[in-house]
């Protein structure tokens, strides 16, 4: 996110992506914000409200069940990732309101904008873990009966979090505050010190590990899962299909603009018109990616309503039904409806 880029040899241009730049004005000089920034602020506000409340509710519902229910462990970890990211939003919001001025210091600059990337990696790795769990339940039910337990689920989550932290380190390390003078302000961004190769490498790794590879593997994984469950009369459910597709698709849909603009900007000359256009859209792309942090509770509630007929239950009990039902491996090696529905709930989009 926020970054520096020297759009021509020398001009202090703040671009919000992953480079440091100089030849366009460091910031718009108008008192009014640009339209993409206004849209980003609206999205941030909505995401913050829905994300904090929704994920707090999910954490509350799943925390009690996480000792014994594996699905609750998955949803708890996903909600924690989303909740953490949402906590950075008031700061990011304030910075955009102040035309990207960053009065919060160097430590905050390194940590807070990196949270969305931590969320991206944590979510996609947790999603991959959940998908592996779903896959094993369908194709290796006997193994699951013997080895699938809460302890293993927690270990898998710990590994996912550890890898996510590791993958976030490059952005964290390159993130710096920079004082600007015309106009006077402090900017928070990523400084690759004119090393375009390093910038491209970070962008490519982010695209491949955080988007393309998961997209490929999860598409294959869910194709197999859905083909198997679809072929069994007892588990044929358009609801299941819809929810699983919604959950996995949400991650890729909302991260797509950020990933595309990020990779394009790393290959474009900072003085090019396309770069400058993409640069103006950056806050909007970040805010769009942030929708991932509030979409899961919405999907859970919509799924819950669908499975319950109408919203007759209280929100917590509805969520409890959706998030804490345990997948039972039957001797028939097929799922019960509830198992498939639970699986559908959220194989979480990162």
């Amino acid at each position: 996110m926020n970054s520096f880029n020297y759009t021509t040899p020398d001009y202090g241009h703040y671009d919000d992506k992953d480079t440091l730049d100089l030849n366009t004005p460091v910031d718009k000089t108008s008192n009014t914000l640009r339209v993409p920034d206004i849209l980003a602020l609206v999205i941030f506000a909505v995401v913050f409200l829905v994300g904090v409340l929704g994920n707090a509710l999910v954490v509350w519902v799943t925390a009690f069940e996480a000792k014994r229910t594996i699905n609750a462990i998955w949803f708890l970890n996903l909600a924690v990732a989303d909740f953490l990211s949402c906590l950075a939003l008031p700061i990011l919001f304030t910075s955009i309101v102040q035309h990207h001025h960053w009065p919060f210091g160097g430590a905050a600059c390194s940590i807070l904008p990196s949270l969305i990337l931590l969320n991206m990696y944590a979510s996609i790795l947790l999603l991959a873990t959940i998908s592996a769990d779903r896959f094993l339940l369908v194709f290796k039910p006997i193994w699951c009966q013997n080895f699938r337990g809460a302890g293993l689920a927690w270990i898998a989550c710990a590994v996912a979090w550890g890898l996510a932290l590791l993958l976030t380190i490059p952005s964290f390390l390159y993130r710096v505050v920079r004082e600007e003078y015309f106009p006077p302000k402090v900017l928070c961004g990523v400084d690759y010190s004119h090393d375009k190769r390093r910038e491209r490498a970070v962008a490519i790794v982010r695209l491949v590990l955080g988007f393309l590879w998961p997209l490929l593997t999860l598409t294959i994984c869910y194709t197999f899962i859905l083909l198997r469950t679809w072929s069994r009369r007892a588990t044929r459910s358009t609801k299941t299909l819809k929810v699983v597709v919604a959950v996995v698709a949400s991650f890729f849909i909302f991260w797509l603009p950020y990933q595309v603009t990020g990779i394009m900007m790393s290959f474009l000359e900072p003085s090019s018109p396309t770069f400058l256009l993409l640069n103006k859209l950056d806050s909007l792309c970040v805010s769009f990616a942030y929708i991932n942090c509030c979409i899961n509770p919405i999907i859970y509630v919509v799924a819950g309503q669908g499975f319950q007929g109408r919203l007759r239950k209280s929100l917590p009990s509805l969520l409890r039904n959706v998030l804490t039902e345990e997948s039972v491996v039957r001797e028939s090696k097929s799922f019960t409806r509830s198992t498939v529905d639970t699986m559908a709930q959220k194989t979480q989009a990162v």
């Epitope: 100089l22 000089t29 003078y181």
Partner: antibody, heavy 116, light 107 residues
Framework: DVQLQESGPGLVKPSQSLSLTCTVT?????????WNWIRQFPGNKLEWMGY???????SYNPSLKSRISITRDTSKNQFFLQFYSVTTEDTARYYC?????????WGQGTTLTVSS | DIQMTQSPSSLSASLGEKVSLTCRAS??????LSWLQQKPDGSIKRLIY???TLDSGVPKRFSGSRSGSVYSLTISSLESEDFADYYC?????????FGGGTKLEIR
């Protein structure tokens, strides 16, 4: 109190190179702010030339970029303006100034005359 | 680059008189404007920054204001040391640019 003092050769011939020095007292050039060069032509027109920031980041006026360079010596608390291949058009009074919120402190200026 | 058009280019006034100098920006500069005073010996001093904020040590008779893209420096009651050259400067983006200056002379 922050004080800036320019010094330079005064008179140079066209196509020669030169260096102007700004010595800062009462403030470290590595603490914060940007340290600028500005010139004033005989007709009184002022032109910003460029700066070196406290962190060493440099920015130039695009119209001058290929002909100047700004450097510093932190041990002496000085920064410099190097001029390559001067012309008579570069005859002016050269000021160094600190930028934090606009240019808040200025030197007295040093006159440079380019003449054969 | 943003053009700063300063007027008048010269002005004659008497001691105790009230005078106003104006500066018009060719683009929005959002109040990122300073007023500078240059004495006959060439020394330059900042009087006002952020369009209307007085620098410390600057007499209260100096004031800055803004109306849209037009910025003004007003001296409420001229004193002998005020006769000098005045420049406006924007620092809203790169490169910062200066007005052409106003020469304030004793009538």
């Amino acid at each position: 109190d922050v004080q800036l003092q320019e010094s330079g050769p005064g008179l140079v011939k066209p196509s020669q190179s030169l260096s102007l020095t700004c010595t800062v007292t009462g403030y470290s050039i590595t603490s914060d702010s940007a340290w600028n060069w500005i010139r004033q032509f005989p007709g009184n027109k002022l032109e910003w030339m460029g700066y070196i920031s406290y962190s060493g980041r440099i920015s130039y006026n695009p119209s001058l970029k290929s002909r100047i360079s700004i450097t510093r010596d932190t041990s002496k608390n000085q920064f410099f303006l190097q001029f390559y291949s001067v012309t008579t058009e570069d005859t002016a009074r050269y000021y160094c100034a600190r930028a934090s919120i606009g240019f808040d402190y200025w030197g007295q200026g040093t006159t440079l005359t380019v003449s054969s | 680059d943003i053009q700063m058009t300063q007027s008048p280019s010269s002005l004659s006034a008497s001691l105790g008189e009230k005078v106003s100098l104006t500066c018009r920006a060719s683009q929005e500069i959002s109040g990122y404007l300073s007023w500078l005073q240059q004495k006959p010996d060439g020394s330059i001093k900042r009087l006002i920054y952020a369009a209307s904020t007085l620098d410390s040590g600057v007499p209260k008779r100096f004031s800055g204001s803004r109306s849209g893209s037009v910025y003004s420096l007003t001296i409420s009651s001229l004193e002998s040391e005020d006769f000098a050259d005045y420049y406006c400067l924007h620092y809203a983006n790169y490169p910062p640019t200066f007005g052409g200056g106003t020469k304030l002379e004793i009538r």
